[in-house]
Interface confidence: medium
């Protein structure tokens, strides 16, 4: 309506004796400013007047004077909008209806605002969400129709009349909607605070009790449950009884369903507060728990760890690790099922106690063959010692042990003949699965772990083998010791270092490289005729005769060898000269005459000297003298000489006749 | 309570032999490991060698190896150690040990006997 | 096989602790967890302190501790005594299936 003024303010406002009151206030005027501000207490129109009467609060007038009385009250506002007021303090006969007269150059208003002043600080208002469920964060929330920039005031929690811990955010508004004070606390609630008293607690600027707000919380909560165990140290022997009690401590709403958990599954039939279990067996052992449901959900008991104690069961035993290498580590670990755990053990190897070893765990540094077996262990607890189980088995790997090589074949073995050997070895694991052998041949292997070497070698000295799994194992090397006939047989000169001549001592030397037998025999030979049994052969003057082809032999066991045909060469100077005649050694003048120089010379003549009757040497050199035609005069005695690099022969004197032809004769 | 008594020691000249036992009680003899151990008047102590408790396996340090044999009767509780080619280092007390038990090797001994003293000297 | 290096002598006074140390190689102490520490009074035989490392036998005092780091094995005595004077060897287990002991220590309580 245009013919209104405006204004907005709280509608009412609370306080209480001795506090004071703040009155957020706007308006506009329907024309100019405002000029005149009175404020009433309970303001009554009169008729007659025309004015309002009532306890004047407070007055503004043109020239701004205010009564002294006034200053309790105070107009905060201005002359065209605000409207604010203040009272402080408040008193209790203040309640009522405070009228605020307004008056412009033209226009005049009464605006109504109710104060309600309580003789002592009214509580607050605690407003709860419509539900509470343990442990889902709720936000209480403490309310209060009051605040005041002249009275400051605090709201505390309390729960079971004990601050609360969490952190209350407070908040104030003095607006023209609305005065309050407002604190907002944000809480996990427990089951545990079903039933609690909550308190919102406003206390002056000092900590002042003024007044207070309470509670009753209502948690909603699954079933919170207690367990009772007899025993109470829930150990017990095979045979024995227990009992569980489940005790409901608290539950909201009311629980509807019981049951019983073992190990977290569900033992069918148990619907009762109280679980009675009757010569119990160790399969008995486990976590137990009650189960109680309300509408908010299932509550579970703390768990009972039920023992049921019994004696060891048989032992296993577990090998770290089999098969194991020799000069490895080994753990042996025994495992027996008892309650309470072993405190003994006995270990056993091959069925033998392990003396000193008493621990779960049995550790060999270092693995021999002889640590293989059966081990097995017997557990022992308070209640007994247990059966010793079936054990397990340590094998213990190693390459073959103690190889030799060894010759099959009789001894002595001769070159040529068909050697066998075989591999021999004490102990493998795993079984030997192939041989070697050195040095290696064309060798044939019939079976495994046997050579067979075909016409064998003089030289063939030694053998080895190695006999194999895993890994191979040397044998140390055979000699095979073959025997064989004398080798290399030759005839070697000794003396002279040089060529041989005639008158020479000579020696000749059979040698030959080697024999086995070492024990051996000469034999020299020249054309077949035996010349005598030593190593060596001697001339004291040799002769040209002496020269040709000779052998040696050397024998021994086993075989005889000859050598090589070896010449000996004896050099000599010509010999056996003679002057030989051809046609004859009468020759008819005119005809031809050949006179040949004859020798016996190693080397051969490789020089001839000519000589006649006088001793007078012929300009001839060569074996042959020619004399053609031949004169009478050429009759005489011719002897020869032949040189060669050893020395000088001269011949006889050889007479040659020359005759006169008939025609020489018919002319005389 | 364990015991173990060592005899045969004596003076005896370089190259001879000579034969130490240890009589032992208080214990199942046949069980243990058992030791010899030297120590040279005023030295350290030496391990000397081991057999097994069954006599099927026996030790020996390299400076005995070759010379020195161990050997036991378990029927007598009887442990042995026959010394030949003695040399003058070898004079020395020795002692007999009892293994910790069925392992032998990474031993240690937890009896010993008093000891027997052997002088090699000529 | 050579011998364990132990140092030749210690010494501490009633009360103090004093730790001997035993040094191999990684064939014996470094290799297996079989070291033995013994006593040694003058004129008798030794006496077995400590086994596997750290072990005691029962009836030694808990003044006595063993322990090992790499190569080199430990002997701790606390709250030293006058009794505790002695000898010490250390013993080890080594690769060769045979054992080997230090030269000893000397230990003189002041």
């Known amino acids: 309506d245009s013919s209104k003024w405006v204004f907005e303010h709280p509608e009412t406002l609370y306080a209480w004796e001795g506090a004071c009151v703040w009155i957020p206030c706007t308006y506009r005027a329907l024309d100019g400013d405002l000029e005149s501000f009175i404020l009433f207490h309970n303001p009554e129109y009169n008729k007659n007047t025309s004015k309002f009467d009532g306890t004047r609060l407070y007055e503004s007038t043109k020239d701004g004077k205010v009564p002294s009385e006034q200053k309790r009250v105070q107009f905060l506002g201005d002359k065209n909008k605000n409207c604010t007021l203040s009272i402080h303090p408040v008193h209790l006969n203040d309640s009522g209806q405070l009228g605020l007269r307004m008056e412009s150059k033209t226009e005049k208003w009464m605006e109504r605002i109710h104060l309600n002043v309580s003789e002592r600080p009214f509580p607050p208002h605690i407003q709860l969400p419509p539900e509470i469920q343990e442990s889902q964060e709720v936000t209480l929330t403490c309310l209060l129709n009051f605040s005041c920039y002249g009275y400051p005031i605090q709201l505390q929690w309390l729960l079971e009349g004990v601050p609360m811990r969490q952190a209350a955010v407070t908040s104030t508004s003095l607006t023209i909607k609305s005065v309050f004070t407002r604190s907002e606390l944000k809480f996990s609630p427990q089951w545990s605070h079903h039933g609690k008293i909550v308190t919102c607690q406003l206390q002056d600027a000092d900590g002042k009790f003024l007044s207070n707000d309470t509670v009753q919380l209502n948690v909603k909560h699954t079933p919170k449950l207690e367990i009772k165990v007899t025993p109470s140290d829930a150990i017990v022997r095979e045979g024995d009884s227990v009992t569980m009690t489940c005790e409901v401590s608290s539950s909201n709403p009311e629980y509807t369903t019981v049951s019983w958990l073992k190990d977290g599954t569900s033992l069918k039939k148990q619907n009762t507060f109280t679980l009675n279990l009757r010569e119990v067996t160790k399969d008995q052992s486990g976590k137990y728990c009650c189960q109680v449901s309300n509408d908010v959900g299932p509550g579970r008991s703390e768990e009972v760890f039920l023992q049921v104690q019994y004696a060891p069961e048989p032992s296993t035993v577990q090998i770290l690790h089999s098969p194991a290498v020799e000069g490895s580590q080994v753990e042996f670990l025994c495992m027996s099922l008892a309650n309470p755990l072993p405190t003994n053990y006995t270990w056993y190897h091959n069925g033998k106690e392990m003396q000193g070893r008493t621990e779960e765990k049995v550790h060999i540094p270092k693995i021999l063959p002889w640590h293989a077996g059966t081990y097995s262990c017997v557990a022992e607890n308070i209640l007994g010692t247990g059966q010793r189980g079936p054990g397990a088995e340590l094998d213990v790997q190693y390459p073959p042990k103690k190889v030799t090589t060894v010759i099959q074949n009789p001894m002595p073995i001769r070159e040529g003949d068909t050697v066998t050997l075989s591999c021999n070895y004490n102990s493998s694991n795993p079984s030997v699965t192939r041989y070697e052998w050195k040095p290696h041949g064309a060798w044939e292997e019939p079976s495994l772990g046997v050579l067979k070497i075909q016409n064998v070698g003089w030289d063939n000295t030694t053998i080895a083998c190695a006999a194999c799994n895993s890994w191979c194992s040397w044998a140390s090397p055979v000699a095979l010791n073959v025997q064989y006939a004398p080798r290399d047989v030759r005839v070697r000169k000794i003396k002279p270092l040089s060529e041989i001549h005639s008158g020479n001592s000579v020696s000749l030397q059979c040698d030959f490289s080697s024999s086995h037998p070492k024990e051996v025999q000469f034999f020299w030979e020249k054309n077949g005729r035996l010349l005598g049994k030593e190593s060596q052969l001697n001339f004291d003057s040799i002769s040209p005769e002496d020269a040709g082809s000779y052998s040696c032999w050397v024998n021994n066991s086993i075989g005889q060898t000859a050598s090589k045909a070896w010449t000996l060469e004896v050099l000599y100077a010509p010999r056996r000269l003679r002057v030989s005649m051809s046609p004859g050694d009468q020759v008819m003048e005119g005809k031809s005459a050949t006179l040949t120089c004859e020798s016996d010379a190693n080397p051969p003549v490789s020089h001839y000297t000519w000589f006649d009757w006088n001793n007078q040497s012929l300009p001839y050199h060569s074996q042959k003298l020619r004399l053609e035609p031949v004169k009478v005069q050429h009759s005489g005695a011719y002897w020869c000489q032949g040189t060669n690099s050893v020395g000088k022969g001269r011949s006889p004197l050889s007479t040659l006749t020359v005759y006169y032809s008939p025609e020489t004769i018919g002319r005389r | 309570q364990v015991q173990l008594v060592e005899s045969g020691g004596g003076v005896v000249q370089p190259g001879r032999s000579l034969r130490l036992s240890c009589a032992a009680s208080g214990f199942t003899f046949s069980a243990y490991g058992m030791h010899w151990v030297r120590q040279a008047p005023g030295k350290c102590l030496e391990w000397v060698a081991v057999i097994l408790y069954d006599g099927s396996n026996k030790y020996y340090a390299d400076s005995v190896k070759g010379r020195f044999t161990i050997s036991r009767d378990n029927s007598k509780n009887t442990l042995y150690l026959q010394m030949n080619s003695l040399r003058a280092e070898d004079t020395a007390v020795y002692y007999c040990a009892r293994g910790s038990g069925w392992l032998q090797l990474g031993d240690y001994f937890d009896y010993w006997g008093q000891g027997t003293l052997v002088t090699v000297s000529s | 096989q050579s011998a364990l290096t132990q140092p030749p002598s210690v010494s501490g006074s009633p009360g103090q602790s004093i730790t001997i140390s035993c040094t191999g190689t990684?064939?014996?102490?470094?290799?297996?967890?079989?070291v033995s520490w013994y006593q040694q009074h003058p004129g008798k035989a030794p006496k077995l302190m400590i086994y596997?490392?750290?072990n005691r036998p029962s009836g030694v005092s808990n003044r006595f501790s063993g322990s090992k780091s790499g190569n080199t094995a430990s002997l701790t005595i606390s709250g030293l005594q006058a009794e505790d004077e002695a000898d010490y060897y250390c013993s080890s287990y080594t690769s060769s299936s045979t054992l080997v002991f230090g030269c000893g220590t000397k230990l003189t309580v002041l």
């Open positions: 596997e490392v750290s």
């Open positions: 990684s064939s014996d102490v470094g290799g297996y967890n079989y």
